[in-house]
Amino acid sequence: HNTTVFQGVAGQSLQVSCPYDSMKHWGRRKAWCRQLGEKGPCQRVVSTHNLWLLSFLRRWNGSTAITDDTLGGTLTITLRNLQPHDAGLYQCQSLHGSEADTLRKVLVEVLADPLDHRDAGDLWFPGESESFEDAHVEHSISRSLLEGEIPFPPTS
């Protein structure tokens, strides 16, 4: 799998999309996990609704949301209020039994907020009880890693 880079600005929202073959993955739940080290396990962050028919419902874990368009074949992950510690390698997965197929490897990069010299009071973030539909989502910048690029810093 190639790795796709998604860049977002600190403090804003980043949307990651993972296209897949809707027929091949019909009836399967999906998940978003974080890779722990180059050879380490992929730790589950959030997964789609337990009832596959309701996969389009947005599921939250903290500031990360997942929703699945099972007809169109697009899994969408939203990282709200992006922070530097969110940077790293992730995977979109398709689940079947205890197994998981990788749909896409994703490198999340967090760029410094160009407004961070401003007073924090000038910035707006959606409150917990506000509809997420009202929140501004920053369009992500994505690219594939070039061959030979390493998503993790080399370990000594």
Epitope: H49, L51, L53, F56, L57, R58, R59, S131
Partner: antibody
Framework: QVQLVQSGAEVKKPGSSVKVSCKAS????????ISWVRQAPGQGLEWMGV????????NYAQKFQGRVTITADESTSTAYMELSSLRSEDTAVYYC???????????WGQGTLVTVSS | EIVLTQSPATLSLSPGERATLSCRAS??????LAWFQQKPGQAPRLLIY???NRATGIPARFSGSGSGTDFTLTISSLEPEDFAVYYC?????????FGGGTKVEIK
């Protein structure tokens, strides 16, 4: 703002059928699920079934399997619930409810009273 | 099917008091649990989804907690408009089921 408007009260004879409508205004109709829930007089809530309009996929509670049909007409943003072989214990207020974003019963219709009496 | 048992059936309290409502599932529903409020002659209204998330426009005095089989809805300080029937609901597994309800009445 999304609203669900249901058809008016019905009085039916035992053995007959009833078809209740639920018209959605605002929002995208096709993408979301429409469920039907009923409530007998003085009783609790009972889920009957759900339909996803854009795929036409439906799922029904076992109790109503074979007696209930849920359909959706995307062109009019209207969902329907038809219940056949009515009996007196089907007397209830029938609600439609739809998803908005995070959960299956975000928004509810005003309810339709169906009375089954000979 | 998953059975949701709510307790107590009736809770008699005065305005300003704290209300604690319980919902117990016959098997784990993870966090796939919602709470609704229903007043006489009205449709139910969503209060809490995913066990602990307040729905849009719901006052902060309503809070939900729990995971697995045991869940709690807390109303920190009852307002006159909070006297109603409250239902829990799970969508972890088909069929979707509701609890029998807890009536919160004025003492």
């Amino acid at each position: 703002q999304v609203q669900l408007v249901q058809s008016g009260a019905e009085v039916k004879k035992p053995g007959s059928s009833v078809k209740v409508s639920c018209k959605a205004s605002g929002g995208t109709f096709a993408q979301y699920a429409i469920s039907w829930v009923r409530q007998a007089p003085g009783q609790g809530l009972e889920w009957m079934g759900v339909i996803i309009p854009d795929s036409g996929t439906a799922n029904y509670a076992q109790k109503f399997q074979g007696r209930v049909t849920i359909t959706a007409d995307e062109s009019t943003s209207t969902a329907y619930m038809e219940l056949s072989s009515l009996r007196s214990e089907d007397t209830a207020v029938y609600y439609c409810a739809r998803t908005q974003e995070n959960t299956i019963f975000d928004i509810w219709g005003q309810g339709t009273l169906v009375t089954v009496s000979s | 099917e998953i059975v949701l048992t709510q307790s107590p059936a009736t809770l008699s309290l005065s305005p300003g008091e704290r209300a604690t409502l319980s919902c117990r599932a016959s098997q784990s529903v993870s966090s796939y649990l919602a709470w609704f409020q229903q007043k006489p002659g009205q449709a139910p209204r969503l209060l809490i989804y995913d066990a602990s998330n307040r729905a849009t426009g719901i006052p902060a005095r309503f809070s939900g907690s729990g995971s697995g089989t045991d869940f709690t809805l807390t109303i920190s300080s009852l307002e006159p408009e909070d006297f109603a029937v409250y239902y829990c609901q799970q969508d972890y597994e088909w069929p979707i089921t509701f609890g029998g309800g807890t009536k919160v009445e004025i003492k």
